[in-house]
Amino acid sequence: PEPPTACREKQYLINSQCCSLCQPGQKLVSDCTEFTETECLPCGESEFLDTWNRETHCHQHKYCDPNLGLRVQQKGTSETDTICTCEEGWHCTSEACESCVLHRSCSPGFGVKQIATGVSDTICEPCPVGFFSNVSSAFEKCHPWTSCETKDLVVQQAGTNKTDVVCGPQDRLRA
């Protein structure tokens, strides 16, 4: 028969022969022959391969370096890489999460729209009219101005995006 020029799924072509790929979690030791199946070996401790493959070496699991603020979110297996995340108060600098930076704080006049996670930074938003933030914080949202009316008080000093209104007693001499 004519030697193949293409192979089925989960096979590869080597020297005019279709050989089975090694399953995830295993590496290639020896190509198949007409008489012998592809020889594969399981990846060692702290190694993985996550696809059907013909790799002769497994990949090393990612190391979550605590010196870079990293910790293990999900331990790797022979078929999956380790997933790192950042320590509390820090987030990844990239999708690959190779290092961490401190969550940013929202300055006075800005509130937290979305609290940071291990993989995303704090999202701040300017405090709209009627709201304020007078602190630098990674958690505080913009607070609404105090409603003087509900306390039977009047506004003595208008609020800003950084300060609350100041309420005071009503002028009793007023008709």
Epitope: N15, S30, D31, C32, T33, E34, F35, T36, E37, E39
Partner: antibody, heavy 117, light 109 residues
Framework: QVQLVESGGGVVQPGRSLRLSCAAS????????MHWVRQAPGKGLEWVAV????????YYADSVKGRFTISRDNSKNTLYLQMNSLRAEDTAVYYC??????????WGQGTMVTVSS | EIVLTQSPGTLSLSPGERATLSCRAS???????LAWYQQKPGQAPRLLIY???ARANGIPDRFSGSGSGTDFTLTISRLEPEDFAVYYC??????????FGGGTKVEIK
């Protein structure tokens, strides 16, 4: 460890039969093709036969075709060579060897077959 | 059928010397599927080199294989006492039959 052990050799008269066995251990026997190779006294190596891992494909050297039959029992991790109509020129040490894309990587210690009247 | 011719038939050398063994094929060996084996008296052959130039597991680096097509060479850079043996080349690309060369005996001078 990975090992092949041949047995069944001996002295036999011309025209008679003999069955050689090769017991495998230390590896997944059912994933490998297997060969028989022989060596006449004081001579070089001569390939005899090969069988595929599942026993479907078999090839023979012209010198033994029609007289020798290679077979295997994967449940017993054993390879066989049935030798019929033996001749004086079949006298040799018979080795079994494992097939890989790297050549014959594991060999047994051999079993001696002497065909003599 | 691919015929393999090995030369010389016998090589007489002293320990520490370099040994160069030749294997010539009657036609090109596809994919360089050529192996070298070592055999000592009363023992089974042992795989040394496969794919013309790759060392098998546990084989010392003083053994090296080279060549392609029809001309192949096994070199032992510095002969050790345990290297005196018979060496066979074998092609496993074109079969049946899988063919062996006639062998080269490396003996102590």
């Amino acid at each position: 460890q990975v090992q092949l052990v041949e047995s069944g050799g001996g002295v036999v008269q011309p025209g008679r039969s003999l069955r050689l066995s090769c017991a495998a251990s230390g590896f997944t026997f059912g994933s490998y093709g297997m060969h028989w190779v022989r060596q006449a006294p004081g001579k070089g190596l001569e390939w005899v036969a090969v069988i595929s891992y599942e026993g479907v494909k078999k090839y023979y050297a012209d010198s033994v075709k029609g007289r020798f039959t290679i077979s295997r029992d994967n449940s017993k991790n054993t390879l066989y060579l049935q030798m019929n109509s033996l001749r004086a020129e079949d006298t040799a040490v018979y080795y079994c060897a494992r097939d890989t894309s790297r050549g014959h990587d594991i060999w047994g210690q051999g079993t001696m077959v002497t065909v003599s009247s | 059928e691919i015929v393999l011719t090995q030369s010389p038939g016998t090589l007489s050398l002293s320990p520490g010397e370099r040994a160069t063994l030749s294997c010539r094929a009657s036609q090109s060996v596809s994919y360089d599927y050529l192996a070298w084996y070592q055999q000592k008296p009363g023992q089974a052959p042992r795989l040394l080199i496969y794919g013309a130039s790759a060392r098998a597991n546990g084989i010392p680096d003083r053994f090296s294989g080279s060549g392609s097509g029809t001309d192949f060479t096994l070199t032992i850079s510095r002969l050790e006492p345990e290297d005196f043996a018979v060496y066979y080349c074998q092609q496993y690309a074109d079969y049946p039959p899988f063919t062996f060369g006639g062998g080269t005996k490396v003996e102590i001078k």
